[in-house]
């Protein structure tokens, strides 16, 4: 019986460990600054790193600019978006800016896109200052199904800060769906 | 066999509970306002509470102004930093401010410091208003190794809001490293 | 013995699954815009959705405008609050605004209310721009006891953005109390 108990314990430990890791997908994606679209309109950001520096992904997929859910669950989603402008980059098109982020969910089965979270601010970036900066942070807890896709839209993409510590988004699974 | 099963269940329950608690380090550190440096562009904040009010720590260490990781894992890190100024405190050095936070990771083995997250804003705090306030929030999911240290740097430390609900940072372990 | 092992495994799998789900309460509550109080003073927001759109709740209770904890534990709490004004809504009472959020905890046993987190900004929303927007995000890790209540207070409630992706708060349990 002792051997059997050890076997039970062993298999359980193995199963618990394995299921724990399998049950916890995550991603932290950082902006790929080599391919930021220009303009001041609202655009979807499709170029993100998933495997360099702080960027990483596990049990989720990054494809076509979207973070794809592989495992049903409740996830905490977050995004940090930084905008900046220095006078040496040239004049702004307007001093009155709307700096925004939208975290959206797309369901392939029912082709539709919905905004989960938004944040931002209107700003007056006057010529009296040589440098301007502004960051947005959003986060929330959402039910995600396998196959659903998360993407990031921003206004004024040409003003994005390209640093990996500045502009990123991510997700981690917290629990299963009942 | 029933007794054996009960023993298996009991030991397992005990093990599961114990390992679950051991596997989840956390910290929530609040600013110690008795020792805020004055100053400049970017200073490291070294005085934080870890055991009073909302501040708490478990399976992590706070030493020399840094939050030290004791257990490898993926952690969610966050910081909330509030700046404020009332005209009764005296005049500002400049009305054009850069209010920033940097969450940094230092590896002792390879002496180097890297910024994990940054946030903030340039602000125009004019004399037309007697009171000014601004808060920054950042958060993200990072792989941390035992011995690595997390610290907070800010601009304009003399403008920090000293309340425990205003200026704090923290971390909690979400999952093991594969 | 094999049957016994299967029974042990089965009961364990069941117990593990059940305890895991039971151990992880959560809530994501979105603003109910049909009942936002007016005014510019600091008010408690009592109308939130818990079961439509992105709003959901499990193993927690929403009652009388407060999120009630049913299970002791350490929780990650968060809030995202958006304010906006368009000139078509009429003139602002003042162009100098203090846009703030306070996440508070109330203990029924010891009738007292404490602010866990605060965030926001003073803003100058001048008439030179037809539209103004600003979002606040706060988050932190707190020990909550069964029966304690979480509520949201804001300044300038009449300026709140009523969208479910804009103004919300939530919580999820991360771990048990030792």
């Amino acid at each position: 019986i002792r051997a059997e108990k050890a076997m039970v314990d062993g298999s359980w430990l193995d199963l618990a460990k394995r299921s724990k890791l399998e049950a916890q997908p995550f991603a932290h994606l950082t902006i790929n600054a080599t391919d930021i679209p220009s303009g001041s309109h609202k655009v979807s950001l499709s170029s993100w790193y998933h495997d360099r520096g702080w960027a990483k992904i596990s049990n989720m997929t990054f494809s076509n600019g979207k973070l794809i859910v592989n495992q049903d669950g409740f996830y905490y989603l977050y995004a940090n978006i930084c905008f900046r402008h220095h006078e040496t980059s040239g004049d702004l098109a307007t001093e009155y800016l709307q700096l925004m982020v939208y975290v959206t969910k797309t369901s392939i089965k029912i082709p539709s896109s919905h905004t989960l979270m938004k944040g931002g601010s209107t700003k007056y970036w006057s010529g009296n200052s040589e440098f301007h900066f502004y960051s947005i942070n959003v986060g929330g807890f959402f039910k995600l199904r396998s196959g659903e896709e998360i993407s990031i839209e921003v206004s004024n993409p040409s003003l994005l800060d390209p640093d990996q510590d500045a502009t990123y988004f991510g997700a981690f699974k917290v629990r299963d769906i009942d | 066999i029933r007794a054996e099963k009960a023993m298996v269940d009991g030991s397992w329950l005990d093990l599961a509970k114990r390992s679950k608690l051991e596997a989840q380090p956390f910290a929530h550190l609040t600013i110690n306002a008795t020792d805020i440096p004055s100053g400049s562009h970017k200073v490291s904040l070294s005085s934080w509470y870890h055991d009073r009010g909302w501040a708490k720590i478990s399976n992590m260490t706070f030493s020399n102004g840094k939050l030290i990781v004791n257990q490898d894992g993926f952690y969610y890190l966050y910081a909330n930093i509030c700046f404020r100024h009332h005209e009764t405190s005296g005049d500002l050095a400049t009305e054009y401010l850069q209010l920033m936070v940097y969450v940094t990771k230092t590896s002792i083995k390879i002496p180097s410091s890297h910024t994990l997250m940054k946030g903030g804003s340039t602000k125009y705090w004019s004399g037309n208003s007697e009171f000014h306030f601004y808060s920054i929030n950042v958060g993200g999911f990072f792989k941390l190794r035992s011995g690595e240290e997390i610290s907070i740097e800010v601009s304009n430390p003399s403008l920090l809001d000293p309340d425990q609900d205003a200026t704090y940072f923290g971390a909690f372990k979400v999952r093991d490293i594969d | 013995i094999r049957a016994e092992k299967a029974m042990v495994d089965g009961s364990w799998l069941d117990l593990a699954k059940r305890s895991k789900l039971e151990a992880q309460p959560f809530a994501h509550l979105t603003i109910n815009a049909t009942d936002i109080p007016s005014g510019s003073h600091k008010v408690s927001l009592s109308s939130w959705y818990h079961d439509r759109g992105w709003a959901k709740i499990s193993n927690m209770t929403f009652s009388n405008g407060k999120l009630i904890v049913n299970q002791d534990g350490f929780y990650y709490l968060y809030a995202n609050i958006c304010f906006r004004h368009h000139e078509t809504s009429g003139d602002l009472a003042t162009e100098y605004l203090q846009l703030m959020v306070y996440v508070t905890k109330t203990s029924i046993k010891i009738p007292s209310s404490h602010t866990l987190m605060k965030g926001g900004s003073t803003k100058y929303w001048s008439g030179n721009s037809e539209f103004h927007f600003y979002s606040i995000n706060v988050g932190g890790f707190f020990k909550l006891r069964s029966g304690e209540e979480i509520s949201i207070e804001v300044s300038n409630p009449s300026l709140l953005d009523p969208d479910q992706d804009a103004t919300y708060f939530g919580a999820f349990k991360v771990r048990d109390i030792d």
Epitope: - | G90, E95, Q98, L159 | -
Partner: nanobody
């Protein structure tokens, strides 16, 4: 690189007035800067006199200068001034202007370490 050039020093009698100038160059604007005046008398330590926030025009003075000295700036010309009235023999010193990025409160700019750039100085002598 910021350059600072002082002018306006000289020999005056007790009770006279003098206006020092400090011309700043090397940047298109100084809106985020604090400009300060320091002085050093022979055989003495360098001493803070006054500081001005370039953006707001608010000033901060050493006690002995309050009511007698006034600092101002012309943001269009990038010049700072120190108007000194009712001069005393103890005001004799080399007066230097300094510039530093503005952080925190203006009252913190009594410390020389807060300034990144310094002028060469101009001599002020008050004879009795």
């Amino acid at each position: 690189e910021v350059q600072l050039v002082e002018s306006g020093g000289g020999l005056v009698q007790v009770g006279d007035s003098l206006r020092l100038s400090c011309e700043a160059s090397g940047r298109s604007r100084f809106s985020t800067y604090v400009m300060g005046w320091f002085r050093q008398a022979p055989g003495k330590e360098r001493e803070f006199v006054a500081a001005i926030s370039w953006s707001s025009g608010n000033a901060y003075y050493i006690d002995s200068a309050k009511g007698r000295f006034a600092t101002s700036r012309d943001t269009a010309k990038n010049i700072m001034y120190l108007q000194m009235n009712s001069l005393k023999p103890e005001d004799t010193a080399v007066y230097s202007c300094a510039a530093g990025r503005g952080y925190g409160l203006l009252s913190e700019y009594t410390q020389a370490a807060r300034y990144d750039y310094w002028g060469q100085g101009t001599q002020v002598t008050v004879s009795s």
